[in-house]
Interface confidence: medium
């Protein structure tokens, strides 16, 4: 139904914002951790993998849910 489609779209849009915020928090935390580790001469590749994942969440998010073409999110969702 249209109501269900709207609800599903709302779920996705909200989830997108949540994921983006989590990404920023996670990257900020990892960056701070990296500074501390580098100060002690440590090396980590954790930041790269996190950055790679979060940078593509928005690109792949529409594939999380089966939507009818007319309710598939467009650039308006990619906030």
């Amino acid at each position: 139904s249209e109501a269900e489609d709207a609800s599903l779209l709302s779920f996705m849009q909200g989830y997108m914002k949540h994921a983006t915020k989590t990404a920023k928090d996670a990257l900020s935390s990892v960056q701070e951790s990296q500074v501390a580790q580098q100060a002690r001469g440590w090396v980590t590749d954790g930041f790269s993998s996190l950055k790679d994942y979060w940078s593509t969440v928005k690109d792949k998010f529409s594939e999380f849910w089966d939507l009818d073409p007319e309710v598939r999110p467009t650039s308006a969702v990619a906030a």
Epitope: S7, L8, S10, F11, G14, T22, Y53, F64, W65, D66
Partner: antibody, heavy 118, light 113 residues
Framework: ELQLVESGGGLVQPGGSLRLSCAAS????????LYWVRQVPGKGLEWVSG????????AYATSVKGRFTISRDNAKNTLYLQMNTLESDDTAVYYC???????????WGQGTQVTVSS | EIVLTQSPSSVTASVGEKVTINCKSS????????????LNWYQQRPGQSPRLLIY???TQESGIPDRFSGSGSTTDFTLTISSVQPEDAAVYYC?????????FGQGTKVELK
């Protein structure tokens, strides 16, 4: 300590209704994505539904779409699952779960048993 | 709907042995742009709720013993218990988080001799 406690399960006749509740504590409920997953005794896990923090976005498994409604009350830190037109295939233990990550459910309740039988 | 098929359906092992559980997806659960696989592994001991072990196919959840590891990509995944212990007797499930509904595999029961 994060805690999820389900309630509201019981015996109901086919075609009947039941509302499950999941009381949450130990985390910021209003920021969490919440889910229901069910398990037929002795069988596997089946994802049922999910809801966003504001409660205005929902997703359902095909098997329950149109019959089940997920909702939440952020003031009461409680998740709900309204189950209508119940069928024998809905007999299962229903778990609520939350995910601190995007894709994985790292916190689960103990489950509540729902039995649909005449 | 993505179908996950686990094998074997059950396995019996002695303490200290290596146990391998496979999970095959009916379609890719990997993001082409970031090469991350949206595949999780859970453990469910008798009478208990599921417990997250592995997410993104190979990332170990906090507090999980190092003997549990995940590998694989695209459609084929593996959960390995390097040296099985008595407390590992349980049913193990894979779950895809790539496309709704977020389906689970049928489960693999691990028993100890």
């Amino acid at each position: 300590e994060l805690q999820l406690v389900e309630s509201g399960g019981g015996l109901v006749q086919p075609g009947g209704s039941l509302r499950l509740s999941c009381a949450a504590s130990g985390f910021t409920f209003s920021n969490a994505y919440l889910y229901w997953v069910r398990q037929v005794p002795g069988k596997g896990l089946e994802w049922v539904s999910g809801i966003n923090p504001a409660g205005d976005g929902r997703a359902y498994a095909t098997s329950v779409k149109g019959r089940f409604t997920i909702s939440r009350d952020n003031a009461k830190n409680t998740l709900y699952l309204q189950m209508n037109t119940l069928e024998s295939d809905d007999t299962a233990v229903y778990y609520c779960a939350t995910a601190s990550r995007v894709v994985a459910y790292d916190s689960w309740g103990q489950g509540t048993q729902v039995t649909v039988s005449s | 709907e993505i179908v996950l098929t686990q094998s074997p359906s059950s396995v019996t092992a002695s303490v200290g042995e290596k146990v391998t559980i496979n999970c095959k997806s009916s379609q890719s659960v990997e993001s082409g742009s970031d090469q991350k696989s949206y595949l999780n592994w859970y453990q469910q001991r008798p009478g208990q709720s599921p417990r997250l072990l592995i997410y993104y196919a190979s990332t170990q959840e906090s507090g999980i013993p190092d003997r549990f590891s995940g590998s694989g990509s695209t459609t084929d995944f593996t959960l390995t218990i390097s040296s099985v212990q008595p407390e590992d007797a349980a049913v193990y499930y894979c779950q895809q988080a790539y496309s709704a509904p977020f389906t689970f595999g049928q489960g693999t029961k691990v028993e100890l001799k």
